[in-house]
């Protein structure tokens, strides 16, 4: 059996439903069978899990994933496979397999596989803060989503009116979430904020720097 | 040699009911899927039913889907199609085929013509 | 469905000559592909599987080639016998659906 899955990695919002594509060509036989299992993203294909089957006429979703499977068409020998998984959990990121066989059509190993990322919207990132804060000092502000998919970009933004930093003295990551202030002045202080995004939205969070002559550093 | 002989056509009113039956020989019936297709006079082929090697799963395009049925019976190496509710569309030669590993048809019958008129 | 569309209807040929008679699938039927011959008051014979597999007893001057939505049926060199009415069939998805069918006539 040859088995056709889409060569694009699949991408479902968190808590829809995701339409796992899955079709083949066969004259289906009574001895027909169709597994669906699951791997977690990094493990090897060996790892798998089932969860759904359709053996003898029937339909047998298992696992943890059990209430939320089913076939876009049953039974699946029309020529569809397709699986649903509804209301989509980020557990349900990782590759999943769809396994038709039909003896005696042994031509391919009738498997196809699948990647699927369930997309989800920045958590509120926690903002903190490390380093000198004294003038001259130099300080980094940290910025960190624990949610998201996929990985938030950070972008940091000082807050109201106030010179323009000289060039080199702030300096940010936007993959790493951290923003490196150098040579700092007193009007370095300030509120700083922080906006994790991705494609599902954004979060923020923010942050009081305050800098000190050398005798005293600390943050509000 | 494979053959495939259809038998069953005949003349039939609007409304009506037809059996077809197809008697195979010179393969392993009980191991290929089998269909019906059919041919309306000077038109082109349409496939009208299917069904696994057990008989298992049965499958029908919309425009038959309720109306006929297909069937088998592996130990008399026969194929069998029951018409009921026919119209004057469903006028046709009917042919057998026997399926491929994949669904194209390798053998055919001859074909029983059916007339649907009043 | 999967609609599948056969050029020309007709074609008019001689023999020797070569013929190359399209078919158009409406999706992406990869390479899952049957043609036919129909000789009058015949039953259909199976050319060509899978877009190019020739069956056991079918003459090499019969050759299918394409995948996804276009596929071709090429006879090298017509002969007396080719003179038929030839249909596609995707055998991908059910339901099975066959092109219109094209006739190849004597010029």
């Known amino acids: 059996v040859e088995v056709k899955v889409p060569t694009e990695p699949l991408s479902t919002p968190l808590g829809k439903t995701a339409e796992l594509t899955c079709t083949y060509s066969t004259s289906v036989g009574d001895s027909f069978a169709l597994e669906w299992s699951f791997v977690q993203p990094g493990k090897p294909i060996s790892e798998s899990h089932p969860i759904l089957y359709f053996t003898n006429g029937h339909l047998y979703p298992t696992g943890s994933k059990s209430k939320r499977v089913s076939l876009l068409q049953n039974p699946p020998t029309v020529g569809v496979a397709t699986l649903k998984l509804t209301d989509v959990h980020p557990s349900d990121t990782g590759t999943y397999l769809c396994q038709v066989n039909n003896p005696p059509d042994f031509y391919t190993n009738g498997l196809g596989l699948i990647n699927l990322t369930v997309l989800v919207p920045p958590s509120n990132p926690l903002c903190s803060q490390s380093g000198q804060t004294s003038v001259g000092g130099s300080t980094a502000l940290r910025c960190s989503s624990s949610e998201g998919a996929p990985k938030p970009v950070y972008n940091w933004v000082r807050l109201g009116t106030f010179p323009t930093p000289s060039p080199g003295s702030m300096v940010q990551d936007e993959v790493s979430g951290q923003l490196i202030l150098t040579n700092l002045s007193l009007t370095s202080s300030g509120t700083y904020r922080c906006v994790a995004t991705n494609q599902m939205g954004s979060a923020s969070c923010e942050l009081t720097l305050s800098v000190t002559e050398p005798s005293q550093g600390r943050v509000a | 040699q494979v053959q495939l002989v259809e038998s069953g056509g005949g003349l039939v009113k609007p409304g009506g009911s037809l059996r077809l039956s197809c008697a195979a020989s010179?393969?392993?019936?009980?191991?290929?899927?089998m269909s019906w297709i059919r041919q309306a006079p000077g038109k082109g082929l349409e496939w009208v039913s299917s069904?696994?090697?057990?008989?298992?799963?049965?499958h029908y395009p919309d425009s038959v889907k309720g109306r006929f049925t297909i069937s088998r019976d592996n130990a008399k190496n026969s194929l069998y199609l029951q018409m009921n509710s026919l119209r004057a569309e469903d006028t046709a030669v009917y042919y057998c085929?026997?399926?491929?590993?994949?669904?194209?048809?390798?053998?055919w019958g001859q074909g029983t013509l059916v007339t649907v008129s009043s | 469905d999967i609609q599948m569309t056969q050029s020309p209807s007709t074609l008019s040929a001689s023999v020797g000559d070569r013929v190359t008679i399209t078919c158009r699938a409406s999706?992406?039927?990869?390479?899952?592909l049957a043609w036919y011959q129909q000789k009058p008051g015949k039953s259909p014979k199976l050319l060509v599987f899978?877009?190019?597999t020739l069956p056991e007893g079918v003459p090499s001057r019969f050759s299918g080639s394409g995948s996804g939505t276009e596929f071709t049926l090429t006879i090298s060199s017509l002969q007396p016998d080719d003179f038929a009415t030839y249909y596609c069939?995707?055998?991908?998805?059910?339901?099975?659906?066959f092109g219109q069918g094209t006739k190849v006539e004597i010029k």
């Open positions: 085929a026997r399926q491929g590993v994949r669904p194209f048809f390798d053998y």
């Open positions: 999706e992406n039927i990869y390479s899952y």
């Open positions: 010179g393969f392993t019936f009980s191991n290929s899927g």
């Open positions: 069939q995707h055998h991908y998805v059910i339901p099975w659906t």
């Open positions: 899978n877009a190019e």
């Open positions: 069904i696994s090697d057990g008989g298992l799963y049965t």
